[in-house]
Amino acid sequence: ALDTNYCFSSTEKNCCVRQLYIDFRKDLGWKWIHEPKGYHANFCLGPCPYIWSLDTQYSKVLALYNQHNPGASAAPCCVPQALEPLPIVYYVGRKPKVEQLSNMIVRSCKCS
Amino acid sequence: ALDTNYCFSSTEKNCCVRQLYIDFRKDLGWKWIHEPKGYHANFCLGPCPYIWSLDTQYSKVLALYNQHNPGASAAPCCVPQALEPLPIVYYVGRKPKVEQLSNMIVRSCKCS
């Protein structure tokens, strides 16, 4: 699997999960999240050659098409597969509240 | 929805489904499919700015991150959302057989 265990410990050039830290205020302009100040969101990057963790029959077809037509703009793209939630603290006025923001952290990628 | 109805009738620059015809022999090197000779597979293409048909909370975060950090390589990608099957005829010896190949035709796209 193209997950953090594999990708963070390798120098994989193809589609893999990469490290990315996002600061809520600086990177998103979000002031409403009190804690954490930022988080390791990660992101997916890298080419999707034929047979590289392809998502569907269509992805396989498109990767093969791209192999036969290297100049074509049609190619599979490296996108999140497994996402995890992030617990946050926000305020309603002066009252702190806790919430889980779903689908916030990328754990693995796929070619779609 | 970024589907064929909308995308094929517009000049949309952002993520949308685009027309692509694939010839099984020429484009894939597949000789085993007898009918059809090829099909309208379509593909997804176009940038994914903030608020443009974003798939998950993570996609929104990443698009916003990209807006604040335009030089970054981390950005959502335009990928298939709805896929449809393709009926094909192939041969086992001289005996024709019909099969549905699932997830072969792109009907709509999303930013993931």
């Epitope: 002031k31 409403w32 305020y91 309603v92 919430e99 | -």
Partner: nanobody
């Protein structure tokens, strides 16, 4: 483009009521935080209360608790400040402020809001 437009201000006798409206545009559907603030002549801007558009969660300052109520109508993209039992010290310019990015919660601090309305004058006198 994000815009906030207040209305409903005016002159009222002590003990009277007013309902202020803040029409919000340019926010993502049902998201964002709206705060109500007032500024009396020669004084700092004071936070009166706020509401999260998503779940309707509200907060009111102690100075107005029990007298002022904040509500929202997401269909009309409007946030209301219902003011009852008004006192002479409630006079001033009332502003609504918006943070379109907020998925949850709302702030009591003016520095947390990027967008502001033009303000509406409230006068309480006998």
């Amino acid at each position: 483009e994000v815009q906030l437009v207040e209305s409903g201000g005016g002159e009222v006798r002590p003990g009277g009521s007013l309902r202020l409206s803040c029409v919000v545009s340019g926010f993502t559907k049902d998201y964002g935080a709206i705060g109500w603030f007032r500024q009396a002549p020669g004084q700092e801007r004071e936070g009166l209360g706020c509401i999260a558009r998503k779940d309707g969660d509200t907060w009111s300052a102690d100075s107005v608790k029990g007298r002022f109520t904040i509500s929202r109508d997401n269909v009309r993209n409007t946030v209301y400040l219902q003011m009852n039992a008004l006192k002479p010290e409630d006079r001033g310019v009332y502003y609504c402020a918006g943070d379109p990015s907020a998925l949850y919660g709302c702030s009591d601090r003016s520095s947390e809001y990027q967008y502001w309305g033009q303000g509406t004058q409230v006068t309480v006198s006998s």
